[in-house]
C-alpha cells in the first residue's frame, strides 16, 4: 500500500528555521504536492506550497524555498521568525497526488523535546482520498 | 538487476553535435529521476543536473545552461545527453546515474551509475 | 555555490590500518544531503555511503561515516587491499550540486 512519509527538522544552525521533507513510497508518479500547516489541506490547514512537476513551485510566506528533491520527496524550508511563524507542536501535512494510487496524505510536527538538528521520526499516517 | 547501459565513445570536432543515450534495465524508468555526471580526463566528478523522468523537465546546473539538453524515450527507459557546438573542454567521460527515491535517511544520492560514455573533442 | 575540500588529496595505508578522510563544506550542509562515493581506476563511481552514515548496499561493515554541519567523514575501521579507490563527498544542501575534489587511498 502506497505510504507518505513525513519529516519535521529545526535546523541547528538557524534556530528559528524549520525544514518539513515529505516522500511518497508508492511506485506510481507524481503528479501534484501540496504542504499545509495546522492540519490537513482542506481540513483547516493553511497552504504553505504546491509543487508541480511540469508546472513549477508556488510558496506563500513563512515557506522561504520549497523544492523537489527527487521525483517522489520534496522539502521545504521555513522562516521562523515573525508572527506567521511555526513553534514546535505545529503540525505539517503533505498531501501526494500521483497516478494511478490517488491522493494520499499524512501529518508529522516536530516534537517538544526534541534537540535542534534533530528530526521528528517519520510519520507515515497514510489518509486514502477519493480525489 | 538494475542497470544503466551507455552508448559508446564518440570523436568529434569542435562546433559539431553529440547524443549520447543511457538505456535502463531493471526497474520502473519513470520512478526515478536521471541525473548526468561530467568526469573530465584526470578530474573529478561534476553534477550537470538532472531530469524528471515523468514530466520530462529538466534542471540544470548553471555551467550546463545553453548547450546541454537532456531529453528522454520513456517508451524504451532511455535517456539522452545531448551537446551542441562542442568545446575542446567538452572532452570528458560523461555518467548517466538514477537519482534514488529519497528516504528519511537522505535525498540526492545517485544509486545506480551508468557505464560511462568518453567523449572527445578535437579538430 | 557550496565548496567541499576533501582532505587529505592522497593519503596510503597498510592493510589492517584505521584510516580517516574528511570532507569539509564551505557552508552548513544538512546531513540528509552529504553522500560518499567509491570511484576505482577507469570504472564507474559507486554509491558508498548516504545521508552522511547509511552504508549503500553491499559496502562492507568496515566503513562508517559521520559529521554535520561543516565537517564529514569517512572512516575504514581495518584498511583492506580492495578499499584502494578515490572517495568523493557530494553535496544536495543546495544548487548547484557539488563533488569534492576526491581523496585518492592507496594501499601499501
Known amino acids: 500500500t502506497p505510504e507518505v512519509w513525513v519529516q519535521v527538522r529545526m535546523e541547528a544552525t538557524e534556530l528559528s528555521s524549520f525544514t518539513i521533507r515529505c516522500g511518497f513510497l508508492g511506485s506510481g508518479s507524481i503528479s501534484l504536492v501540496t504542504v499545509s500547516w495546522g492540519g490537513p489541506n482542506g481540513a483547516g490547514g493553511t497552504t504553505l506550497a504546491v509543487l508541480h512537476p511540469e508546472r513549477g513551485i508556488r510558496q506563500w510566506a513563512p515557506a522561504r524555498q520549497a523544492r523537489w528533491e527527487t521525483q517522489s520527496s520534496i522539502s521545504l524550508i521555513l522562516e521562523g521568525s515573525g508572527a506567521s511563524s511555526p513553534c514546535a507542536n505545529t503540525t505539517f501535512c503533505c498531501k501526494f497526488a500521483s497516478f494511478p494510487e490517488g491522493s494520499w496524505e499524512a501529518c508529522g510536527s516536530l516534537p517538544p523535546s526534541s534537540d535542534p538538528g534533530l528530526s521528528a521520526p517519520p510519520t507515515p499516517a497514510p489518509i486514502l482520498r477519493a480525489d | 538487476q538494475i542497470q544503466l547501459v551507455q552508448s559508446g565513445p564518440e570523436l568529434k570536432k569542435p562546433g559539431e553535435t553529440v547524443k549520447i543515450s543511457c538505456k535502463a534495465s531493471?526497474?520502473?524508468?519513470?520512478?526515478?529521476?536521471m541525473s548526468w555526471v561530467k568526469q573530465a580526463p584526470g578530474k573529478g566528478l561534476k553534477w550537470m543536473g538532472w531530469i524528471n523522468t515523468y514530466s520530462g523537465v529538466s534542471t540544470y546546473a548553471d555551467d550546463f545552461e545553453g548547450r546541454f539538453a537532456f531529453s528522454l524515450e520513456t517508451s524504451v527507459s532511455t535517456a539522452y545527453l545531448q551537446i551542441n557546438n562542442l568545446k575542446n573542454e567538452d572532452t570528458a567521460t560523461y555518467f548517466c546515474?538514477?537519482?534514488?527515491?529519497?528516504?528519511?535517511?537522505?535525498?540526492?544520492?545517485?544509486?545506480?551509475w551508468g557505464t560511462g560514455t568518453t567523449v572527445t573533442v578535437s579538430s | 555555490d557550496i565548496v567541499l575540500t576533501q582532505s587529505p588529496a592522497i593519503m596510503s595505508a597498510s592493510p589492517g590500518e584505521k584510516v580517516s578522510m574528511t570532507c569539509s563544506a564551505s557552508?552548513?550542509?544538512s546531513s540528509w544531503y552529504l553522500h560518499w562515493y567509491q570511484q576505482k581506476s577507469g570504472a564507474s563511481p559507486k554509491?558508498?555511503?548516504?545521508?552522511?552514515?547509511n552504508l549503500a548496499s553491499g559496502v562492507p561493515a568496515r566503513f562508517s561515516g559521520s559529521g554535520s554541519g561543516t565537517s564529514y567523514s569517512l572512516t575504514i575501521s581495518s584498511v583492506e587491499a580492495e578499499d584502494a579507490a578515490t572517495y568523493y563527498c557530494q553535496q544536495y544542501h543546495s544548487d548547484p550540486y557539488t563533488f569534492g575534489s576526491g581523496t585518492k587511498l592507496e594501499i601499501k
Open positions: 557552508s552548513s550542509v
Open positions: 531493471g526497474y520502473t524508468f519513470t520512478t526515478y529521476g
Open positions: 546515474a538514477r537519482l534514488g527515491r529519497g528516504s528519511t535517511t537522505g535525498a540526492g544520492y545517485l544509486d545506480v
Open positions: 554509491l558508498w555511503i548516504y545521508g552522511t552514515s
